[in-house]
Amino acid sequence: HKSSSQGQDRHMIRMRQLIDIVDQLKNYVNDLVPEFLPAPEDVETNCEWSAFSCFQKAQLKSANTGNNERIINVSIKKLKRKPPSTNAGRRQKHRLTCPSCDSYEKKPPKEFLERFKSLLQKMIHQHLSSRTHGSEDS
């Protein structure tokens, strides 16, 4: 169905944008509070959205040092913004078998961001591999 695939595309383009925000934050990793955060890795199939929400819930914080505080806080806020809802996301919400956020290994900000980026890339890969050839236009 064309409109639902366009909605999915728009949703994945948002994921694509999140990767750039993660990359931006990686530049300021020394200005983040060096706290250990749950960082899902090797996420099992159908638990991607659950893992995604774990990354969004994590308390990534600026160390409030230097003049990078504003860009860091804006970037973190954008990472936490709720993405548009999709059927895939709704379906996965009903899976009770996905690990809880606390069960994931905790990592410092650098590895946390790297793992977040890997998950986003995996989700985009799954989306692009499952759709027919054609444009990402909306």
Epitope: R16, E136, D137
Partner: antibody
């Protein structure tokens, strides 16, 4: 259909600033980030940075940080790229490009010539 | 920054020829590789995104393949309108970077 229409050619003196505009149409302006890329005469393409038109969030290339400012006007679906402290090496064609999964639509380019 | 090395930098070919352009990244870019076409005085056009996905309106004679660090753009049967410069670009990591370009000229 998606269209990106850029402002006309500019001639500037070294040390001056230039502001290039890029008017978008044919899609929801705030759904897609806009990137800026430049091309010096006879050279390849160089990425300058990107702006999220929904909230004016920007990411700039280290090569231009401190000299480039990207802004937007949602009422006219236009993004702007301002480059300051111009030098002769900034002579180039400047492109805006919409970013979906890639830079899927590009403006026609704006030639900026820096000459004393 | 991720470096992209395109080869060849230029090539001469005839209409109907099969043309292959390669792009090598300095690190694994996980298929986040796009191809563009540029003609003098014209807007740049996206041909292929995410290694092998054909952008809308792009003829099927264009195809892309690759993984890891090595990627290829193939034009199965070169047409007169295909004489242009082609660029690869990685979308894996900021900053966005482009290959040096490959100019396809008429033999």
């Amino acid at each position: 259909q998606v269209q990106l229409v850029q402002s006309g050619a500019e001639v500037k003196k070294p040390g001056a600033s230039v502001k290039v505009s890029c008017k978008a149409s044919g899609y929801t302006f705030t759904d897609y980030w806009m990137h800026w890329v430049r091309q010096a005469p006879g050279q390849g393409l160089e990425w300058m940075g990107t702006i999220d038109p929904s909230d004016q969030y920007t990411i700039y290339s280290q090569n231009f940080k401190g000299r480039v400012t990207m802004t937007r006007d949602t009422s006219t679906s236009t993004v702007y790229m301002e480059l300051s402290s111009l030098r002769s090496e900034d002579t180039a064609v400047y492109y805006c490009a919409r970013y979906g999964f890639a830079m899927d639509y590009w403006g026609q380019g704006t030639l900026v010539t820096v000459s004393s | 920054d991720i470096q992209l090395t395109q080869s060849p930098s230029s090539l001469s070919a005839s209409v109907g020829d099969r043309v292959t352009i390669t792009c090598r990244a300095s690190q694994d870019i996980s298929n986040f590789l796009n191809w563009y076409q540029q003609k003098p005085g014209k807007a740049v056009k996206l041909l292929i995104y995410y290694t092998s996905r054909l952008h809308s309106g792009v003829p099927s004679r264009f195809s892309g393949s690759g993984s890891g660090t090595d990627y290829t753009l193939t034009i199965s049967s070169l047409q007169p309108e295909d004489f242009a410069t082609y660029y690869c670009q990685q979308g894996h990591t900021l900053p966005r970077t482009f290959g040096g370009g490959t100019k396809v000229e008429i033999k």
